[in-house]
Interface confidence: medium
């Protein structure tokens, strides 16, 4: 079932829940999701994803129990995860994907939840304990049962069968608004320093909302819509309304590149590179975002906002939504797609417009541009050459640009001063009667992986500084430590002096400042994907693989990583499978991934393992895997007996004979031994790995794996004629580790 970020199912509960066996399988890309709530006035059971971790909260009376999955294992990865929560006889157990994640004692009282079960969200339920819970699920519940009963029947019209395509759509898949009430909500659009919203719009709607972001506490907002076939932007701040129209028609069913840019000084809308903007003096001031960024439609609150402001929007238009699609969506330079949406209504993955919009020649004249990458703007010649007006002082003869730019070199995660040599003037400033303080820099597009920090009062918010500040070492670039080796800043440089000079200097020239990042070796780290506790059965061995621990190193491949087991090598429980009895004090990441290593328990308290991983240059901090050895518990699962004709043979299969153990994520060796003499036949095992035609040999012992592979049989060898059916009592004992269960 598909939940779109605002939907839920309600399932009544007839009685208090004494035992709970809850099984869910879900997938989502959102780090927050409410999966299930069993609700009473005070008692409740809540399962939610929070920061990508599964959290369970069980409140019984005045007691609260919380279970959660480890921080290292994020479940918001769009992959289906299976959750099993059981509460039986005062004990709660949580497992995810077959691994035991947490367990705890709980009060014995039944769970009183007369309000019922809420799946995927809480609807309009107004209970105090719901404050601070996660958002409704945006993703899929592939299965959900409580005590054997499905929670996904019947579905409501808003919760769809199956798992919607949009949840797995990458950000190069268009947002399709199929109307009439389509809407996509994304995380808030922050415009503190500056805000940009970019997308390619294809529509025939002449009147439709495109983007709405509420702000502040006084009803402030930014609103972009199609008004009479053209783009319009409205910014409402406490001190008044700024309204801007663009003259390029967009409601023609053709793709149009749209860009909205706002900062504290101006608002700009650009359609197909044709900009319209407010004057620099229209001080907008910072709009603190509230709620989500709405695209393609409006919710009730946004509609109310707009009607109250009487912007010529009729109620019908307010409720309408875009019919069309948005491609290559980017918010403040970050790509966004359907996967990142917080909620969607009536959306489609991809651009499926009405049939008549797909005429053969509709996109013909766009073919030439189809190979241009969206990031192609850096290839423009920057700055655009300046042609000085006639009659300027001789210093401006042959003048084309004010600065010669040199790359700024910074260490990964380090800082570097922006200096004179990086932005060197091409002319003698004194001769041009210009002072360094009159050369004004403005950061129009920040770097992807760092921040230009300005040690000048008030400048950090304005992102403006002068050439004098550069000389005085007031501007430095701080890199965020990511691995990319190149980056750039876009600077607009203007001159504020009142002396004769080319008008392009008053208007400003745009420069690209390349940033070269010198890589630094990051130390590797050890992570435990399923928590740093491993359970092993006494006197058994357990494979050590990436499901137990892994190395994480952003700049080294597995081939270059080596693990060391710290501590004394004598009696070390880690061994290579092919070298039993020999401690493995050092092993490669490849060996770990190949499953070559085992932990061998030989008795006594289990030895914790402390590891370090090295990339050849740096080693990780030591990390400890706590190991607990538990006594094997063996339980007969099946012992049905066999019926066969005298003189024939019959395989013993798991359906006839199998046992279960308390092993956690461990494939243990289960040995069966015959303890009494057989009267009428013999037990046989097939040799040579069970190859077809391999011989059968009499045996007194076999493993459960042999049974699973069909390599154990009973052969009737009694030649005597009997008037009645004979019964062979096969006396067996089972051994796991050193634990033996007799008289099977």
């Amino acid at each position: 079932a598909s939940f779109f970020g605002e939907n839920h199912l309600e399932v009544p509960v007839a009685t208090a829940l004494t035992d709970i066996d809850l099984q869910l399988q879900f997938s989502t890309s959102q780090p927050e999701a409410l999966l299930l709530l069993a609700a009473g006035p005070a008692d409740h059971l809540l399962l939610q994803l929070y920061s990508g971790r599964l959290q369970v909260r069980l409140v019984l009376g005045q007691e609260e129990l919380r279970l959660q999955t480890p921080a290292e294992t994020l479940l918001s990865d769009s992959i289906p995860h299976t959750v099993v929560l059981t509460v039986v006889e005062g004990w709660a157990t949580l497992s995810v994907d077959g691994f035991l994640n947490a367990s705890s004692a709980v009060p014995g009282a039944p769970l009183e939840v007369p309000y019922g079960l809420f799946v995927g969200g809480t609807g309009t339920l107004g209970l105090p304990y719901l404050r601070g819970t996660s958002r409704p699920l945006r993703g899929c519940l592939h299965a959900a049962t409580l005590n054997g009963r499905s929670l996904l029947r019947p579905l409501t019209p808003d919760v769809h069968e199956g798992c919607a395509e949009e949840f797995s759509a990458s950000d190069d898949v268009a947002l399709g608004f199929s109307g009439p009430h389509s809407l996509a909500a994304f995380p808030a659009w922050g415009t503190q320093d500056e805000g940009t919203l970019e997308f390619t719009l294809t529509t025939q709607s002449r009147q439709a909302p495109l983007a709405f972001q509420a702000g502040g506490r006084r009803g402030d907002f930014i609103y972009v819509d199609i008004f009479e076939g053209h783009l319009r932007a409205v910014v409402e701040k406490g001190q008044g309304t700024v309204l801007l129209h663009n003259s390029v028609p967009v409601a023609d069913g053709q793709p149009h590149e749209v860009s909205v840019h706002i900062n504290a000084h101006r608002l700009e809308i650009s359609v197909d590179q044709y900009p319209t903007h407010t004057s620099n003096r229209g001080v907008l001031s910072y709009l603190e975002p509230r709620g989500s960024l709405l695209l393609g439609g409006l919710d009730a609150e946004a509609s109310r906002h707009l009607q109250e402001h009487r912007l010529g929007l009729t109620p019908e238009a307010t409720n309408a939504s875009l019919l069309g699609c948005m491609e290559d969506l980017s918010v403040n330079g970050q790509r966004r797609g359907l996967r990142e949406a917080l909620l969607t209504r009536n959306m489609a993955a991809g651009c499926r417009l009405e049939e008549e919009e797909y005429e053969d020649d509709a996109y013909g004249h766009y073919e030439a541009f189809s190979t241009l990458a969206p990031e192609a703007w850096p290839a423009m010649e920057l700055p655009e050459p300046c042609v000085p007006e006639p009659g300027l002082p001789p210093v401006f003869a042959n003048f084309t640009q004010l600065l010669t730019i040199s790359p700024l070199v910074v260490a990964e995660g380090g800082t570097a001063w922006l200096e004179w040599r990086h932005v060197q003037p091409t002319l003698d400033l004194m001769e041009a009667e210009l002072r360094k303080s009159q050369v004004l820099f403005s950061v129009t597009r920040g770097a992807r992986h760092g921040e230009l920090e300005l040690d000048i009062p008030g400048a950090q918010a304005r992102k403006m500084f002068t050439l004098l500040d550069v000389v005085n070492r007031k501007a430095r670039f701080i890199h965020d430590g990511s691995e990319d080796t190149s980056d750039q800043l876009v600077l607009e440089v203007s001159v504020t002096a009142r002396v004769p000079m080319p008008s392009c200097l008053r208007r400003g020239q745009t420069y690209l400042l390349p940033i070269q990042v010198n890589p630094v070796n990051d130390p590797p780290h050890i992570i435990f994907p399923h928590g740093s506790l491993m359970v092993i059965l006494e006197h058994t061995q357990k494979p050590l693989g990436p499901e137990v621990f892994q190395a994480y190193d952003p700049d080294s491949a597995c081939e270059g990583l080596t693990f060391q087991v710290l501590g004394t090598s004598s009696g070390l429980p880690v061994e290579r499978r092919d070298q039993p009895g020999e401690p493995a004090t050092e092993f490669s990441c490849r060996e770990l991934e190949a499953g070559s290593l085992v932990y061998v328990h030989r008795g006594g308290p289990a030895q914790d393992l402390t590891f370090r991983v090295s990339d050849g240059l740096q080693a990780s901090p030591p990390a400890t895997l706590k190991v607990v050895a538990i006594r094997p518990a063996i339980q007969i699962h099946r012992s049905t007996g066999l019926r066969l004709a005298q003189g024939s043979a019959m395989p013993i299969l798991p359906a006839n004979l199998s046992v279960e153990t308390n092993a956690v994520g461990q494939d243990v060796s289960v040995l069966f031994r015959v303890t009494g003499a057989l009267q009428f036949g013999e037990l046989q095992k097939q040799g040579a790995g069970g190859v077809e035609g391999a011989e059968w040999w009499a045996t007194q012992a076999f493993h459960q794996r042999d049974v699973e592979q069909g390599r154990v049989r009973y052969l009737s060898t009694d030649p005597q004629h009997h008037a009645y059916d004979t019964v062979e009592n096969l006396a067996l004992e089972v051994q796991v580790g050193q634990e033996i269960l007799s008289n099977l």
Epitope: Q62, E64, L125, L127, Y129, G132
Partner: antibody, heavy 121, light 111 residues
Framework: QVKLQQSGPELVKPGASVKISCKAS????????MNWVKQRPGQGLEWIGR????????NYNGKFKGKATLTADKSSSTAYMQVSSLTSVDSAVYFC??????????????WGQGTTVTVSS | DIELTQSPASLAVSLGQRATISCRAS??????????MHWYQQKPGQPPKLLIY???NLESGVPARFSGSGSRTDFTLTIDPVEADDAATYYC?????????FGGGTKLELK
Amino acid sequence: QVKLQQSGPELVKPGASVKISCKASGYAFSRSWMNWVKQRPGQGLEWIGRIYPGDGDTNYNGKFKGKATLTADKSSSTAYMQVSSLTSVDSAVYFCARGNTVVVPYTMDYWGQGTTVTVSS
Amino acid sequence: DIELTQSPASLAVSLGQRATISCRASESVDSYGNSFMHWYQQKPGQPPKLLIYLASNLESGVPARFSGSGSRTDFTLTIDPVEADDAATYYCQQNNEDPLTFGGGTKLELK
């Protein structure tokens, strides 16, 4: 019945640290949040932060980050608050208060008697 | 942080009369259909005692002459009729948002 018993008054020198305790009884200590609240003489109440003893999870008022450290010992059902780098403004009565689970994130339904901390040279 | 402003700072009421204390929040403390505002009573040398939770719910063991009302940003605690034992300082507190904050307190005296 629920009872929160706090440690006795403390007279400490400026720059030193103090650790006060709050022993809980009459309820499942590890499964309810414990809040800490400050009250300067003749003044109002200020929330310092809370701890969930079950797993040691803490939430602090930004004003007290780095000043107060909350810990809990499940085995003795005791919550602790350490206040460091003491100055005269840290002279106050400090209360521990249980978070009532039914109202998230928990009204304070039972309070300790308070521990008076006096900072003086 | 959400600021809570209580008024009046102090008030003197005769026995048997009604006392009304107001608390205003700098922003709404409502969510999920509830108002996350609570009232406490504190007597000298004692810890605070919870009287009203979620704006209007009486804590068990608290006399019915205490009542609470209000939503979003404006809340009222009413004591009717006032008894001698009610002389104390009363605090409002919100927990709609961390950090939890308290009002400055209202001191109730008897005439």
